[in-house]
Interface confidence: low
Amino acid sequence: DAHKSEVAHRFKDLGEENFKALVLIAFAQYLQQCPFEDHVKLVNEVTEFAKTCVADESAENCDKSLHTLFGDKLCTVATLRETYGEMADCCAKQEPERNECFLQHKDDNPNLPRLVRPEVDVMCTAFHDNEETFLKKYLYEIARRHPYFYAPELLFFAKRYKAAFTECCQAADKAACLLPKLDELRDEGKASSAKQRLKCASLQKFGERAFKAWAVARLSQRFPKAEFAEVSKLVTDLTKVHTECCHGDLLECADDRADLAKYICENQDSISSKLKECCEKPLLEKSHCIAEVENDEMPADLPSLAADFVESKDVCKNYAEAKDVFLGMFLYEYARRHPDYSVVLLLRLAKTYETTLEKCCAAADPHECYAKVFDEFKPLVEEPQNLIKQNCELFEQLGEYKFQNALLVRYTKKVPQVSTPTLVEVSRNLGKVGSKCCKHPEAKRMPCAEDYLSVVLNQLCVLHEKTPVSDRVTKCCTESLVNRRPCFSALEVDETYVPKEFNAETFTFHADICTLSEKERQIKKQTALVELVKHKPKATKEQLKAVMDDFAAFVEKCCKADDKETCFAEEGKKLVAASQAALGL
């Protein structure tokens, strides 16, 4: 349904508050270095223009596309070339190339200062003084640091952020009320950003077909009672929503997501019995709730898959005449029967099935050729099961911090060329799989663990893509989306790596470490551990453990000393000498 003015259409659909918030998110995700005030000015100008179009859709420029309007506005920024360098060249292009150019310059690791949380009283005063500016600043700071954050979901986070301040700033103990809520929002926000980043990478690097396959598998697990035609419709609509958001079309994305939530709730009888509570909530909560809803119960007495996909005489005929629909049906039928499998495993099985049919349907006796295809699935299923079992045992034995350290050593030996901050960040996140998933019963472990690992490894892939340093990382990241985790798991120690020269400065610590939070102190120690492995990749677990134990004792001792700085200087030298001796550096 064509509208005379797209900007007026979206303004009316979304309402002024959401319109302004989404335009701010879009601009902050494109121009990540621009000051807050500049973005607010641009957003206000766009909003005033949208209002003129609502009043008269035939007014000048109201018929222009949103990309044209927003791109023109972004290109008015005076300091574009000084701040963004070659990104300014985008402005010389015409749509749609200009928008594509902006997208290519999104930075997953922008050089921005870490967000420091002010004192609670300071935050509450700012909230009460100007609530609107306070909440806009939240959107701006998150959006510029997470340029692929799922925009309609960020509106939901902002709503919760506002609710936290509204409640806690009038509580007797403001800090006790507010800080746990802010911690929860921060952690959930990071997880949400990483999950969406994988969706965008899937669409942008592997195409719509890859994303649709992922969606068929996930929705079939979640809605096993829904008909294949229903799942197909949801997949088509969901793909459109995420394509729009990943492409910077945030107004269309938010509008279409609302339509999809409405459709799901109007048709919940034929989708899932678990949607009732979600569908009673307001829009933002409803969409979030649907996205997180638990899997429905599997229908009773589902027939064997073999009948339609192995034993039927029509397998090759069905496959030849409608390949993607037939494979989609296979994936749907397999996924709805296996909520205990990870989505990536289901996609590997579908790929194996597809490869077998490609080969066998050209053979002299196709049925004889593909008759044992399900036997090929066994090792594919057992590999993640065994890996998760082993790693959960290790996690339960070591606890999260030491489990992260084991992964730090493992991954630094696999890909020592990767920057130390990236190795620390990724390995810490990989290590969180233990506390996140190992507590689950067997039937929920694999979907929890392997799909989470896909999200974390995608962080490694997008960070590495910005500054590629390892052919092995590039290979694992680009060859197959669903085989990334097995590819990284299969990497052994990189024998070609030339150890880093020893630099005493890397292992020099100061009294400021004593005032850090436990998390920050862990990161300091883990950074040192990565550097140690880079210097001595052949060091044994026992050698590394001994050095790390000495290091922990050194920090504890000096943080208790009266003259901390002197202790760190003198004892630090001794520790470095002892470590060099222990590791033979």
Epitope: P224, F228, L302, K317, M329
Partner: nanobody, 115 residues
């Protein structure tokens, strides 16, 4: 986009007949086996009948054998269910599905058998 649209339901007296149709689009209809599934009020979905892609092989649930006939016209992308000697216990929403799935579709057509 895969779509299935059922029609032909209605109110009929016991012993009467109805013919249901299912118009399919968005996929190569002639390549897939199809089924009819029904769901009576307050009950789970029940598989009724299936037909292979060419229309040669047909299967029926014991409860409808001899009374119902499934057929298809691949040139029209349409599936049919001819229902004779209808009984009150045949009252349900009828859905067509791709393959031999017992899950229900999104629309369906209501068949009510009552005097």
């Amino acid at each position: 986009e895969v779509q299935l649209l059922e029609s032909g339901g209605g109110l009929v007296q016991p012993g009467g007949s109805l013919r249901l149709s299912c118009a399919a689009s968005g996929f190569t209809f002639g390549s897939f086996g199809m089924s009819w599934v029904r769901q009576a009020p307050g009950k789970g979905p029940e598989w009724v009948s299936a037909i292979d892609s060419g229309g040669a092989d047909t299967r029926y649930a014991e409860t409808v054998k001899g009374r119902f006939t499934i057929s298809r016209d691949n040139s029209k992308n349409t599936l049919y269910l001819q229902m004779n000697s209808l009984r009150p216990e045949d009252t349900a929403v009828y859905y067509c599905t791709i393959g031999r799935s017992t899950s229900r579709g999104s629309q369906g057509t209501l068949v009510t058998v009552s005097s």
